[in-house]
C-alpha cells in the first residue's frame, strides 16, 4: 500500500510531492545525516535498548514493529523490535524498515514508480483542479538551484533536508515542502500507520532528535486509536 512508502516521521522516502521534484527519486534518500536507518533502529544496541511493551505496531517507533521477542512466543507478551533490513524475512509491511515493504516474505525496497499512479490519484482527488493551479504532476512547483546558496531557514521551501540549516529537516507542510525543526523531547511526532491506505501524507513532522524515539504518549493509552498522540521520548 501507499503507506509502506510514506513514513512521515523520518521524511526520507517521500513520493515526488506537489512542491518537489518528481524527476529526483533519489532526493528522498538525500536527507540530513542521522535520519536514514538502513541498519534498523540505530539506537537499539544490546547495551542501551530497553524493551518497550506494545500491543500494536502503532505504539512503537517508526523504525520498530510490535511482536513477540521469541519465535512462536506468547502472543500476549509483545515488545517493540528493531525493523527488518532489506532482504530480511518478514510477514507484514510494518516489520520492514522505512523505505521498504514486505513482498513475498522478504523486505524489499519501495519502488516509488510503483506507487506513482496511486499518489497522483490522491493528489487530484484532494486538491481538485478547480481549487488551484495545480494539475496532478503537470505543473509542479519547481525550485531553482540558486536558492540554495544559503541553507534554508525555518519555514522556507526545500526539496530535501540538505537544503535546510542545521537542526531542520525538509518536510511536507500541506501544499509544499518546507524546512521544519527536528523534534525535541515531549514534542508531538508522527507514528505513521503502515496498515491500510491513508492517502498522500500532506503534513509531515521531522524525525525525533538524537536519543529520542516516537512513541505513544503515556497518558493517551486509554484513548481511542485515532486520537492518541505520539511524542518524542527518551529511549
Amino acid at each position: 500500500t501507499l503507506n509502506s512508502v510514506l513514513n512521515s516521521n523520518a521524511i526520507k522516502n517521500l513520493p515526488p510531492p506537489l512542491g518537489g521534484a518528481a524527476g529526483h527519486p533519489g532526493s528522498a534518500v538525500s536527507a540530513a545525516p542521522g535520519i536514514l536507518y538502513p541498519g534498523g533502529n540505530k539506537y537499539q544496541t544490546i547495551d542501551n535498548y530497553q524493551p518497550y511493551p506494545c500491543a500494536e505496531d502503532e505504539e512503537c517507533g517508526t523504525d520498530e514493529y510490535c511482536a513477540s521477542p521469541t519465535r512462536g512466543g506468547d502472543a500476549g507478551v509483545q515488545i517493540c523490535l528493531a525493523c527488518r533490513k532489506r532482504r530480511k524475512r518478514c510477514m507484514r509491511h510494518a516489520m520492514c524498515c522505512p523505505g521498504n515493504y514486505c513482498k513475498n516474505g522478504i523486505c524489499v525496497s519501495s519502488d516509488q514508480n510503483h506507487f506513482r499512479g496511486e499518489i497522483e490519484e490522491t493528489i487530484t482527488e484532494s486538491f481538485g483542479n478547480d481549487h488551484s493551479t495545480l494539475d496532478g504532476y503537470s505543473r509542479r512547483t519547481t525550485l531553482s538551484s540558486k536558492m540554495y546558496h544559503t541553507k534554508g531557514q525555518e519555514g522556507s521551501v526545500c526539496l530535501r533536508s540538505s537544503d535546510c540549516a542545521s537542526g531542520l529537516c525538509c518536510a511536507r507542510h500541506f501544499w509544499s515542502k518546507i524546512c521544519k525543526p527536528v523534534l525535541k523531547e515531549g514534542q508531538v511526532c508522527t507514528k505513521h500507520r503502515r496498515k491500510g491506505s491513508h492517502g498522500l501524507e500532506i503534513f509531515q513532522r521531522c524525525y525525533c532528535g538524537e536519543g529520542l524515539s516516537c512513541r505513544i504518549q503515556k497518558d493517551h493509552h486509554q484513548a481511542s486509536n485515532s486520537s492518541r498522540l505520539h511524542t518524542c521520548q527518551r529511549h
Epitope: 506537489l18 512542491g19 505543473r139 509544499s176 515531549g186 508531538v188
Partner: antibody
Framework: QVQLVESGGGLVQPGGSLRLSCAAS????????MSWVRQAPGKGLEWVSV????????YYADSVKGRFTISRDNSKNTLYLQMNSLRAEDTAVYYC?????????WGQGTLVTVSS | DIALTQPASVSGSPGQSITISCTGT?????????VSWYQQHPGKAPKLMIY???NRPSGVSNRFSGSKSGNTASLTISGLQAEDEADYYC???????????FGGGTKLTVL
C-alpha cells in the same frame, strides 16, 4: 527582522475592484509561500489565498474564488491581491502573512471597505 | 463556513492558569493532529504563539503551551499576566480542499 507592509486599501463601491500590495523585507521573500488573511470588523480571521514561492501554485477560499487573484513579484519582494467584483461582505482588514510554518509573520493590515 | 469551535470568552486572575479549547472534526483538526494558536491584541496583527500542537516559536513565553486530544486542541496560559489579555485564535487545515481554517476566536480577560 521580518517586516510586511500592506497598502492599497480604501473605500470602493460594490462591484468595483481594488489591488492590494504587500512589501516584504528582512527575509528571503522568494523562499516562502505567502498568504492573504482577512478580518471583518469585530469578527474572526478568515484565510483568503496563498501563493507558492515561485508563483506556480495558488489556492483560494471558496468565498473569493473566481473574483480574487493572488500574485507576487519576487524581484520586487512584493505580494499582490487583485480583488474584482467586490461585495459588502468583503469589507475587512486584509493582512499579508508569511506562510512558513503556518502564518509566522503578519503585516499590520490594510482596511478595505465595500459600500455604496 | 467551516470553522473550529472556540468559547467566546474566558477570564482569569493574574497568576492563575486558564485553558482555551478548540474543537474540530476528523476532517480538520482531528485528522491532521495539527493545530496552531495566534494571539491578537486590539488593533494589532495576530502573532503566532503555538504551532504543530505544542511547539513554541522562538521568543514566545514558556507560559504558553498547547495540547490536543481527539478532535479538541487546547491552549493553556499559566501565570496569567495583564498583557495576556487579547483575542486567541486556533487554526488547523481542512482536508478537501486543503485550506487553512480558523476558530471563531476567544476573548481572554485578565481580571
Amino acid at each position: 527582522q521580518v517586516q510586511l507592509v500592506e497598502s492599497g486599501g480604501g473605500l470602493v463601491q460594490p462591484g468595483g475592484s481594488l489591488r492590494l500590495s504587500c512589501a516584504a523585507s528582512g527575509f528571503t521573500f522568494s523562499s516562502y509561500w505567502m498568504s492573504w488573511v482577512r478580518q471583518a470588523p469585530g469578527k474572526g480571521l478568515e484565510w483568503v489565498s496563498v501563493i507558492s514561492s515561485d508563483s506556480s501554485s495558488t489556492y483560494y477560499a471558496d468565498s473569493v474564488k473566481g473574483r480574487f487573484t493572488i500574485s507576487r513579484d519576487n524581484s520586487k519582494n512584493t505580494l499582490y491581491l487583485q480583488m474584482n467584483s467586490l461585495r459588502a461582505e468583503d469589507t475587512a482588514v486584509y493582512y499579508c502573512a508569511r506562510h512558513g510554518i503556518d502564518f509566522d509573520h503578519w503585516g499590520q493590515g490594510t482596511l478595505v471597505t465595500v459600500s455604496s | 463556513d467551516i470553522a473550529l469551535t472556540q468559547p467566546a470568552s474566558v477570564s482569569g486572575s493574574p497568576g492563575q492558569s486558564i485553558t482555551i479549547s478548540c474543537t474540530g472534526t476528523s476532517s480538520d483538526l482531528g485528522g491532521y493532529n495539527y493545530v496552531s494558536w495566534y494571539q491578537q491584541h486590539p488593533g494589532k496583527a495576530p502573532k503566532l504563539m503555538i504551532y504543530d500542537v505544542n511547539n513554541r516559536p522562538s521568543g514566545v513565553s514558556n507560559r504558553f503551551s498547547g495540547s490536543k486530544s481527539g478532535n479538541t486542541a487546547s491552549l493553556t496560559i499559566s501565570g496569567l499576566q495583564a498583557e495576556d489579555e487579547a483575542d486567541y485564535y486556533c487554526q488547523s487545515y481542512t482536508y478537501t480542499p486543503i485550506s487553512p481554517v480558523f476558530g471563531g476566536g476567544t476573548k481572554l480577560t485578565v481580571l
